[in-house]
């Protein structure tokens, strides 16, 4: 499994280095998750032709993946730090059920899938410490998540492969947008 952020050889070899700031830690965490997603996407794309498929809309109907929009205040135009931070945390919490679905979906990258899931939990904790308005963050309903997970796991093989591809792609996009937004904070 990949080495979590802050534990790579360069960090170990340089104990005199300044400790990471909160923003740097968040940045490093997101990059680490993105690296994991890249590895998972590689396996998905090698295993099937989903990455080139034009039938994504068929599977997308079953999913309600978090997505950034203008109103969320995360884009350069209309940027709003607090609104955006709430959106990022809420979105990550909503992605957790989909990351749970990804477990057992990979053969050679099983550990990588687990690392992405666990690192996302850590990222949420980092961001919650940064947020001033925790009351505005809505946590997904566990019962709804459980039934969604059951529904996704009951899909046929083709739809499961497509769902895996779409989750990875959407999560990557959400994190990239989050990364850009967090650097404006």
């Amino acid at each position: 499994a990949p080495v979590p952020p802050g534990e790579d050889s360069k960090d170990v070899a340089a104990p005199h280095r300044q400790p990471l700031t909160s923003s740097e830690r968040i940045d490093k965490q997101i990059r680490y998750i993105l690296d994991g997603i890249s590895a998972l996407r590689k396996e998905t794309c090698n295993k099937s032709n989903m990455c080139e498929s034009s039938k994504e809309a068929l599977a997308e109907n079953n999913l309600n993946l978090p997505k950034m929009a203008e109103k969320d205040g995360c884009f350069q135009s209309g940027f709003n730090e607090e609104t955006c931070l709430v959106k990022i945390i809420t979105g990550l919490l909503e992605f957790e059920v989909y990351l749970e679905y990804l477990q057992n979906r990979f053969e050679s990258s099983e550990e990588q899938a687990r690392a992405v899931q666990m690192s996302t939990k850590v990222l949420i904790q980092f961001l919650q410490k940064k947020a001033k308005n925790l009351d505005a963050i809505t946590t997904p309903d566990p019962t709804t998540n459980a039934s969604l997970l059951t529904k996704l796991q009951a899909q046929n093989q083709w739809l499961q492969d497509m769902t895996t591809h779409l989750i990875l792609r959407s999560f990557k996009e959400f994190l990239q947008s989050s990364l850009r937004a967090l650097r404006q904070m």
């Epitope: 940045d27 993105l34 690296d35 950034m68 929009a69 884009f75 990239q176 947008s177």
Partner: antibody
Framework: QVQLVQSGGGLIQPGGSLRLSCAAS????????MVWVRQAPGKGLEWVSD????????YYADSVKGRFTVSRDISKNTVYLQMNSLRAEDTGVYYC?????????????WGRGTLVTVSS | DIVMTQSPSTLSASVGDRVTITCRAS??????LAWYQQKPGRAPKALIY???TLESGVPSRFSGSGSGTDFTLTISSLQPEDFATYYC?????????FGQGTKLEIK
């Protein structure tokens, strides 16, 4: 093959407007991050603007913010750079390019560039 | 804004030489650095990204290293087609910024 064909450059007076076009082939702009970079005569490269396919959000350099607008026409697989209130310092070669599909943001495909000259 | 400073501005070398160009960022950018090659009248071409990953199709004589604020581009054995201007670019935060360029010329 993957390529970007640019058009729309030329000589324009200060305060004038110009629209640059960038037609993509070999890939779809609706699932790629696009970027405009410019180069003043004899100078280095300067980032101008980004267009992210994800939700279509745009980013601009401070030097062009409020004057330049990037947009796209997915049906034509084309990206545009609308340049208003042009100044002499906007003179240069404008490159349309594509960010690679990874999170380390390097530019892997470049157009050949189009020259914009702002002069009276 | 992150300022990228390249050195030297001009470098004279001969075919077969090993050359190194350095790029320094005004603040830490981790490995978010790319190198480009540009020949007169042409668009730039990506050589390296993520500080040390070679772009596909780029000859292995090109290599990149560094992390944080200090980066290097090395050409192990100069070929005639390598005489050009080289730029580094940070993609740590917007505005994305480029170094001022290093012109590699024939000695």
């Amino acid at each position: 093959q993957v390529q970007l064909v640019q058009s729309g450059g030329g000589l324009i007076q200060p305060g004038g407007s110009l629209r640059l076009s960038c037609a993509a082939s070999g890939f779809t702009i609706s699932s790629n991050y696009m970027v405009w970079v410019r180069q003043a005569p004899g100078k280095g490269l300067e980032w101008v603007s980004d267009l992210y396919y994800y939700a279509g959000d745009t980013y601009y350099a401070d030097s062009v913010k409020g004057r330049f607008t990037v947009s796209r026409d997915i049906s034509k697989n084309t990206v545009y750079l609308q340049m208003n209130s042009l100044r002499a310092e906007d003179t240069g070669v404008y490159y349309c390019a594509r960010w690679a599909d990874d999170h380390y943001y390097h530019i892997d495909v470049w157009g050949r560039g189009t020259l914009v000259t702002v002069s009276s | 804004d992150i300022v990228m400073t390249q050195s030297p501005s001009t470098l004279s070398a001969s075919v077969g030489d090993r050359v190194t160009i350095t790029c320094r960022a005004s603040q830490g950018i981790s490995s978010w650095l790319a190198w480009y090659q540009q020949k007169p009248g042409r668009a730039p071409k990506a050589l390296i990204y993520k500080a040390s990953t070679l772009e596909s199709g780029v000859p292995s004589r090109f290599s990149g290293s560094g992390s944080g604020t200090d980066f290097t581009l090395t050409i192990s054995s100069l070929q005639p087609e390598d005489f050009a201007t080289y730029y580094c670019q940070q993609s740590y935060s917007t505005p994305w910024t480029f170094g001022q360029g290093t012109k590699l010329e024939i000695k």
